[in-house]
């Protein structure tokens, strides 16, 4: 199809080489066409058109994304050619940064239902650059945490070194929905609730004498509880002796509950004590069996192919540790009688 009639938007993605970050493009269909498509909630009351010529479907996934090759080849269907780019409804998600994402992206409705719709498309010219200047030493991360129940703020990474007075107007989206009242370089939250978690996008406009473009950044926000003040609990084993049958295989499970820590480096391991000797046992990897906002339960098993007489003289010790401290629970094997 002819893309010369598409509305055009220029975007800049400046990514940090130090951290993983994502990027998104919204299918910003031109007014008035977008009204039946994506982000209808992004229209302000003053923008609602009286005349709605674009009779598209209300299905929010009814758009098609293409990339325009720089060599002038035909448009390529994003879904077929680019595994690191995912379409979710009207949003294109870039999972990995890199200058190779630079290019022209076109979106349009899948279904053309009226003559007006032929030009119902938007071309986004995306420029991707690595961050070069270290002028802003403490620029905000693309992953930010908010402490539940307290005050907090979400900063736009590309503007986090600007004072409020200098900051240009910022357009914020949360999970693809426009936050029309948020216009600052940071969203100040009076009290953090779990619904503040999500994917935030901040846009601001930069101009020179020739043109203007949108600088965009994506911030993943999670809501967290305060770091635990407790060392981990061992939930299992509870008893310090375990009845076993000689010659049979045995699995002993160690389950421990670790309180939330922002920097989480849990340790859970088994070691064996035999008279004056002790050594760590090579056992299967630990696995998380339950994770909540406040804590995580991690399990690690020790597996004996068959219980021997020697095992009865040993102590099997589960050792767990977080940044606060460690806890151990030892198990002595006892032969089952009768």
């Amino acid at each position: 199809f002819n893309i010369s009639g598409c509305s055009t938007k220029k975007l800049l993605w400046t990514y940090s080489t130090r951290s993983e970050e994502e990027f998104v493009l919204f299918c910003d269909l031109p007014e008035p066409q977008k009204s039946h498509f994506c982000h209808r909630n992004r229209l302000s009351p003053k923008q609602v058109p009286e005349h709605l010529p674009f009779m598209g479907s209300n299905d929010l996934s009814d758009v098609q994304w293409y990339q325009q090759p720089s060599n002038g080849d035909p448009l390529e269907d994003i879904r077929k050619s680019y595994p690191h780019i995912i379409q979710d409804k009207c949003t294109l998600h870039f999972l990995t940064p890199g200058v190779n994402n630079s290019g022209s992206y076109i979106c349009r409705p899948k279904m053309i239902k009226s003559p007006y719709d032929v030009a119902c498309c938007v071309k986004m010219i995306l420029e991707v650059k690595p961050q070069t200047n270290a002028s802003c030493e403490y620029s905000a991360s693309h992953k930010q945490d908010l402490l539940l129940g307290s005050t907090g703020s979400i900063s736009c990474p590309s503007l986090s070194c600007q004072s409020d007075a200098q900051s240009p107007a910022v357009t914020w989206y949360k999970n693809g929905k426009l936050l029309s009242v948020e216009r600052s370089n940071r969203i100040v939250v009076d009290e953090v609730y779990d619904y503040h978690q999500g994917t935030y996008v901040c846009d601001y406009t930069q101009s020179d004498t020739v043109s203007s473009w949108t600088v965009r950044a994506v911030v993943q926000v999670r809501t967290i509880v305060g770091d635990t003040k407790l060392k981990p609990d061992i939930l299992d084993p509870v008893e310090d002796t375990l009845e076993v049958e000689l010659g049979k295989p045995l699995t002993i499970s160690c389950k421990a509950r670790f309180g939330f820590e922002r920097v989480f480096n849990p340790v859970i391991k088994w070691y064996i004590k035999d008279s004056d000797l002790e050594w760590e046992v090579s056992v299967p990897e630990a696995k998380s069996i339950k994770s909540t906002l406040k804590d995580e339960i991690i399990e690690r098993n020790i597996i004996l192919e068959k219980v021997t007489q020697r095992d009865l003289r040993r102590k099997f010790v589960c050792f767990v540790q977080n940044s606060i401290g460690n806890t151990t629970q030892s198990v002595q094997l006892k032969e089952k009688r009768g």
Epitope: D164, A165, S167, P168, A169, T171, S180, V181, E182, R183, S184, I187, V188, V189, D190, E191, Y204, T205, Q206, S207, S212
Partner: antibody, heavy 113, light 111 residues
Framework: SVEESGGRLVTPGTPLTLTCTVS????????MSWVRQAPGKGLEYIGI?????TTYYANWAKGRFTIAKTSTTVNLKITSPTTEDTATYFC???????????WGPGTLVTVSL | AAVLTQTPSPVSAAVGGTVSISCQSS????????LSWFQQKPGQPPKLLIY???TLASGVPSRFKGSGSGTQFTLTISDVQCDDAATYYC???????????FGRGTEVVVK
Amino acid sequence: SVEESGGRLVTPGTPLTLTCTVSGFSLNSYDMSWVRQAPGKGLEYIGIIYNSGTTYYANWAKGRFTIAKTSTTVNLKITSPTTEDTATYFCARTHNTLPFYIWGPGTLVTVSL
Amino acid sequence: AAVLTQTPSPVSAAVGGTVSISCQSSPSVYNNNRLSWFQQKPGQPPKLLIYYASTLASGVPSRFKGSGSGTQFTLTISDVQCDDAATYYCAGGYSSISDNGFGRGTEVVVK
């Protein structure tokens, strides 16, 4: 900086457009608000124009005012002035939908027969 | 429509003393913190003192302090100076931008 102009004596019903001229920053990047103050009275928020051109008006101001912009100016049109519209009109660079640091000195509009 | 009710004028303060002005919002301001305080002297445009309910604007002396959340807010001026004689306005931002507005103002007279 920000400076308002266009304030003058008008008769009721005669439309009047006020202009706010900005320098040192781009209207492509900042939101702007209009606020007015009747003689001896308090401040009244009229409305805001976003850098994108989207406008919002205070409930009381809807239909009575129109805000628009060019590359360097923000205009406030008083569609059909009445004597109650006599006031000093200020424009201000806006932060998060509320007027912020940079205010103009104001321009006086007098509506009288 | 939102209503911002300020302490009635005038309020007297002695030099070196402390004065508090209250501002009550109905309904709650956006995010419980979208409230600003302005100082205005005759013949001048307003000057921003506080935003986000408690953040001091650049260049404003720390004698000015904003507090409160949701519907109840206070501007406190400690160690009052003669230069603080002015009218003080609160301004609220709301989830419907059309509700944004100012309180009626509180005149502070310094003795």
